[in-house]
């Protein structure tokens, strides 16, 4: 199934910002022709993964969607908004054989899925069911509808420093 439609799916184009550089980087071009910038020694907190100027945390504990949302909020982040194919591929690569809540919920009154930043998701969600208003990734290569009350792992996301 096509996960991302070509229509407006809430994509934002992402690019790598100047958050990571060689440790002795300066603001001027380096001898090898790369632009390097001064930066912190760690752009993500310990045990968070860096990808395209964002930091991602994959929990090992499980909780409901609401508790997962609050957990991420407590870490200064949100449940992951997987709105580019590149980000999905990256997360598929590190989720392996587990299910993780993401920041995608079904709005019954609108009959549509929205990311928690309120952008519309027009792609495909499998396993849809009347009582499945939250979504997971992992285990399969698709977004799967899931009960918001069942406990799953979670993926949190925030900006890199």
């Amino acid at each position: 199934p096509q996960i991302f439609n070509k229509s407006n799916d809430g994509f934002t184009t992402t690019r790598s910002y100047g958050t990571v550089s060689q440790i002795f980087g300066s603001s001027s071009p380096s001898p090898n022709g790369f632009i390097t910038t001064r930066s912190y020694g760690t752009v993500c907190p310990k045990d968070w993964e860096f990808y395209q100027a964002r930091c991602f945390f994959l929990s090992t504990s499980e909780s409901s969607w609401n508790e997962s949302r609050d957990f991420c909020k407590g870490k200064g982040s949100t449940l992951a908004i997987v709105n580019t194919p590149e980000k999905l591929k990256f997360l598929q690569d590190i989720t392996d054989a587990e299910k993780y809540f993401i920041g995608l919920i079904y709005h019954r009154e609108e009959k549509r899925w929205r990311w928690i930043n309120n952008s519309v998701f027009n792609g495909n969600v499998t396993n849809q069911n009347q009582n499945f208003n939250c979504a997971t990734i992992g285990l399969t290569k698709t977004f799967d509808a899931a009960s918001c009350d069942i406990s799953y792992r979670r993926i949190c996301e925030k900006n890199a420093k």
Partner: antibody, heavy 119, light 107 residues
Framework: EVQMQQSGAELVKPGASVKLSCTAS????????MHWVKQRPEQGLEWIGR????????KSDPKFQGKATITADTSSNTAYLQLNSLTSEDTAVYSC????????????WGQGTLVTVSA | DIVMTQSHKFMSTSVGDRVNITCKAS??????VAWYQRKPGKSPQVLIY???TRHTGVPDRFTGSGSGTDFTLTISNVQSEDLADYFC?????????FGAGTKLELK
């Protein structure tokens, strides 16, 4: 400004030991993992191991067990690599490299310390 | 351990050429592969991570591709400053392992 300052070059005799240091400034090493990598000019790169400075727990390539010991001192914000029973095969540049995640690639490298083992 | 094999120890090229540097993993590593450039007396610099994501500040003539076991670093429109050693690294599992390197030199 962030820096990883490694100790200076070492010329040591076969059978001796050496302890290299890597002092971080601009960030707290407790907030990351500190890795060590061996580089030889005509050969590839070899990952030696890492330490979690917050608790001292290390993970290393079994082929370096007995050869390399990684420690850290959070009060001085410094990671160390001790190399024992040195032979000519240990002549190399040793670099420290911090990385916070568990899927480890290296955007940062210290400048490296050259260790030369020679009688 | 996962062995990363770079079959070409040396590759000859000319300025303006396109070159493909290959790396093969002994088992499936997904896309958990990085590519580095190393010049004499310098620390390595990461070019590509997660197999195809270009690192900040790296010129767009460097492109990474592949997944599973076969990976390629492509340098299009080679420049003289690109003459260096190139290494792949897998980070799917510990111990982290690197390829033996490919030296890019002028014909």
């Amino acid at each position: 400004e962030v820096q990883m300052q490694q100790s200076g070059a070492e010329l040591v005799k076969p059978g001796a030991s050496v302890k290299l240091s890597c002092t971080a400034s601009g960030f707290n090493i407790k907030d990351t993992y500190m890795h060590w990598v061996k580089q030889r000019p005509e050969q590839g790169l070899e990952w030696i191991g890492r330490i979690d400075p917050a608790n001292g727990i290390t993970k290393s390539d079994p082929k370096f067990q007995g050869k390399a010991t990684i420690t850290a001192d959070t009060s001085s914000n410094t990671a160390y690599l001790q190399l024992n029973s040195l032979t000519s095969e240990d002549t190399a540049v040793y670099s420290c490299a911090p990385y916070s995640g568990n899927y480890v690639w290296f955007p940062y490298w210290g400048q490296g310390t050259l260790v030369t083992v020679s009688a | 351990d996962i062995v990363m094999t770079q079959s070409h120890k040396f590759m000859s090229t000319s300025v303006g050429d396109r070159v493909n540097i290959t790396c093969k993993a002994s088992q499936d590593v997904g896309t958990a592969v990085a590519w580095y450039q190393r010049k004499p007396g310098k620390s390595p610099q990461v070019l590509i991570y997660w197999a195809s994501t270009r690192h900040t500040g790296v010129p767009d003539r460097f492109t990474g591709s592949g997944s599973g076991t076969d990976f390629t670093l492509t340098i299009s429109n080679v420049q003289s400053e690109d003459l260096a050693d190139y290494f792949c690294q897998q980070y799917r599992s510990y111990p982290l392992t690197f390829g033996a390197g490919t030296k890019l030199e002028l014909k």
